[in-house]
């Protein structure tokens, strides 16, 4: 048993059948000594008395806030929450599988540039009694801050017959140093609580590889005299780090017919400006990515052709 | 160049070597991002190659202030991945393919190194370890790593060339 | 819990073959080499050989000849044989971990030791 | 092969007071590509196996004091007890792991004068 936050505890669980449970003991938070009695959630019934409450904790039953009382009055709470483990594996019940970029992915981050700044999110099935807490580091065996901001609930998107929750969370390194190669990984720890069920999630990444630019700005064509090319020009994205000189992005820029089934004409160049072809009812869409470290594209921008 | 006393290096021939790096390094070894290998108790390995550091002064206020400190790292750091891609950890079984860019990536390193010292200057004499033996199946992990570093590393000197060939070339 | 233990014949006759075992549990063979050390009594730490994580081994050139260090990785056990046994090989003798990685590294966790005494 | 020179071979000092030991290698420990000193300090107390204290030169173990620090680089090295402990009156030995064969120094006394 280990203390969550105050008064909140979380009792491990290995989850078989006729698993012997977990004995706990729990203390009233209390100077009385004498007529203290314990009861567990909205029950009157009467657990136990004296300081101290042995109970063996087997299942969800067993879990839940135990309140001391004297004479009526509430003395201190307890709540506990179970924390399973199912063939030496604790469980994922509360959030989804995203399975990308690979399997038993629970929580993905992305950051915009290289200012320390991230953004983490996670999809669950649950719509209520569900509370999340983040926190990060930069490294495990001597961790340097991250500040992350309060869970927040992002998206709600129909699936079939169920409904999928997206919550999100930004994060900020402390000490962020854009220009230096990351040595150590950034951590990220959520602990996920759904009624009397707790969880925790895992992310370890560094900076650089979960880079996704935002889509080029200001994406303009000027037609070029007596001819069917037009010059495309672009700009770096606001959200991308400066100065553009040392934080240098590549591009690609695709020609693309009305129909998926045209054939996309690419160019790739580090310049903010290209020359295509363009057809008719066709788009110009130009995507970013980091010139020297090959981490995600962005998003096209595009533009139609006529 | 990059000379005692601080004189520039060639810094749009240093672009281009480290551009070329950083293109090799990703064609030597193309698995973007998240095969994560932090999960094979990569610690050590990562904390055993060079880094680029904040106080390493390789930042665009730094290489304004003074590009040296950042370009004898980036040689330090050139230095010592090209003795790893010459050990045996690359050379040994299983051999490397006839086309691997891991050849030419080395050769890139050398050539970007002696860019940045060229005859009769020396910077302290690089010494580098005695490499623990490995076997062919710790050979593949640990190439696995050492690109995946490298990979990072000449990102940044690309950025420093880069910067340096727009903002402090002659 | 980290743990090395060893055993091993503490008393030998002058030509014969010493031989120790070094059981290791709490961590796993594919990340760490085993080393032995030896210290003759009031005197220093002289390092004896490895045995690396994938199997080879490496001495001290002046054991080489007649050391032999070896792994049964069923049983997470390492032995040292040392040969031709003479007076100089009165010595302490520890088993210690280092952690596999692109160099060679330092000893973090010994074996209790073991005292081999050789005398006729 | 790296040779550890260590001095002074004893250190005559009372509880409290401050204790420094040098580390002397043949040739440089110092690896610059990745800013790493090869070099390890431990201690023995009769009848033990030696304890890790630092590593990489500077970096305490974990669960050692903090009056235990590691300094140097290169070729010069030292251990420092910032205000000697009781306990702390053992042999201290450096170990080089740069080159192998790993080698030791030859081991300082610090006695309770």
């Known amino acids: 048993i280990w203390e969550l936050k105050k008064d909140v505890y979380v009792v491990e669980l290995d989850w078989y059948p006729d698993a012997p449970g977990e004995m706990v003991v729990l203390t009233c938070d209390t100077p009385e000594e004498d007529g203290i009695t314990w009861t567990l959630d909205q029950s009157s019934e009467v657990l136990g008395s004296g300081k101290t409450l042995t109970i063996q904790v087997k299942e969800f039953g067993d879990a839940g806030q135990y309140t001391c009382h004297k004479g009526g009055e509430v003395l201190s709470h307890s709540l506990l929450l179970l924390h399973k483990k199912e063939d030496g594996i604790w469980s994922t019940d509360i959030l989804k599988d995203q399975k990308e970029p690979k399997n038993k992915t629970f929580l993905r981050c992305e950051a915009k540039n290289y200012s320390g700044r991230f953004t983490c999110w996670w999809l669950t099935t649950i719509s209520t009694d569900l509370t999340f807490s983040v926190k990060s580091s930069r490294g495990s065996s001597d961790p340097q801050g991250v500040t992350c901001g309060a869970a927040t609930l992002s998206a709600e998107r129909v699936r079939g017959d169920n409904k999928e929750y997206e919550y999100s969370v930004e994060c900020q390194e402390d000490s962020a140093c854009p220009a230096a190669e990351e040595s150590l990984p950034i951590e990220v720890m959520v602990d996920a609580v759904h009624k009397l069920k707790y969880e925790n999630y895992t992310s370890s990444f560094f900076i650089r590889d979960i880079i996704k630019p935002d889509p080029p700005k200001n994406l303009q064509l000027k037609p070029l005299k007596n001819s069917r090319q037009v010059e495309v020009s672009w700009e770096y994205p606001d959200t991308w780090s400066t100065p553009h000189s040392y934080f240098s992005l590549t591009f690609c820029v695709q020609v693309q017919g009305k129909s998926k089934r045209e054939k996309k004409d690419r160019v790739f160049t580090d310049k903010t400006s290209a020359t295509v072809i363009c057809r008719k009812n066709a788009s110009i869409s130009v995507r970013a990515q980091d010139r020297y470290y090959s981490s995600s594209w962005s998003e096209w921008a595009s533009v139609p052709c006529s | 160049r990059a000379v005692p006393g601080g004189s520039s290096p060639a810094w749009t021939q240093c672009q281009q070597l480290s551009q070329k790096l950083c293109t090799l390094a990703w064609s030597a070894h193309p698995l973007v991002g998240h095969m994560d290998l932090r999960e094979e108790g990569d610690e050590e390995t990562t904390n055993d190659v060079p880094h680029i550091q904040c106080g390493d002064g390789c930042d665009p206020q730094g290489l304004r202030d003074n590009s040296q400190f950042c370009l004898q790292r980036i040689h330090q750091g050139l230095i010592f991945y090209e003795k790893l891609l010459g050990s045996d950890i690359f050379t040994g079984e299983p051999s490397l393919l006839p086309d691997s860019p891991v050849g030419q990536l080395h050769a890139s390193l050398l050539g970007l190194s002696q860019l940045l010292q060229p005859e009769g200057h020396h910077w302290e004499t690089q010494q580098i370890p005695s490499l623990s033996p490995s076997q062919p199946w710790q050979r593949l992990l640990l190439r696995f790593k050492i690109l995946r570093s490298l990979q990072a590393f000449v990102a940044v000197a690309a950025r420093v060339f880069a910067h340096g060939a727009a903002t402090l070339s002659p | 819990e980290v743990q090395l233990q060893q055993w091993g014949a503490g008393l030998l006759k002058p030509s014969e073959t010493l031989s120790l075992t070094c059981a290791v549990y709490g961590f796993s063979l594919i990340s760490y080499n085993v080393h032995w050390i030896r210290q003759p009594p009031g005197k220093g730490l002289e390092w004896i050989g490895v045995?690396?994580?994938?199997?080879?081994?490496d001495y001290n050139s002046v054991l080489k000849s007649r050391v032999t260090i070896s792994v049964d990785t069923s049983k997470n056990q390492f032995s040292l044989k040392l040969s031709s046994v003479t007076a100089a090989d009165t010595a302490v003798y520890y088993c210690?971990?280092?952690?596999?990685?692109?160099?060679?590294?330092?000893?973090?966790?010994w074996g209790q030791g073991t005292l081999v005494t050789v005398s006729s | 092969e790296i040779v550890l020179t260590q001095s002074p071979a004893t250190l005559s000092l009372s509880p409290g007071e401050r204790a420094t030991l040098s580390c002397k290698p043949s040739q440089s420990l110092l690896s610059s590509g990745n800013r790493k000193n090869y070099l390890a300090w431990y201690q023995q107390k009769p009848g033990q196996a030696p304890r890790l204290l630092i590593y990489?030169?500077?970096t305490r173990q974990s669960g050692i004091p903090d009056r235990f620090s590691g300094s140097g680089s290169g070729t010069d090295f030292t251990l420092t007890i910032s205000r000697l402990e009781p306990e702390d009156f053992a042999v201290y030995y450096c170990l080089q792991h740069f080159n192998y064969p790993w080698t030791f120094g030859g081991g300082t006394k610090v006695e309770i004068k």
């Open positions: 210690a971990r280092d952690k596999y990685g692109l160099f060679p590294g330092y000893f973090d966790y």
């Open positions: 990489y030169a500077s």
């Open positions: 045995i690396w994580t994938g199997g080879s081994t």
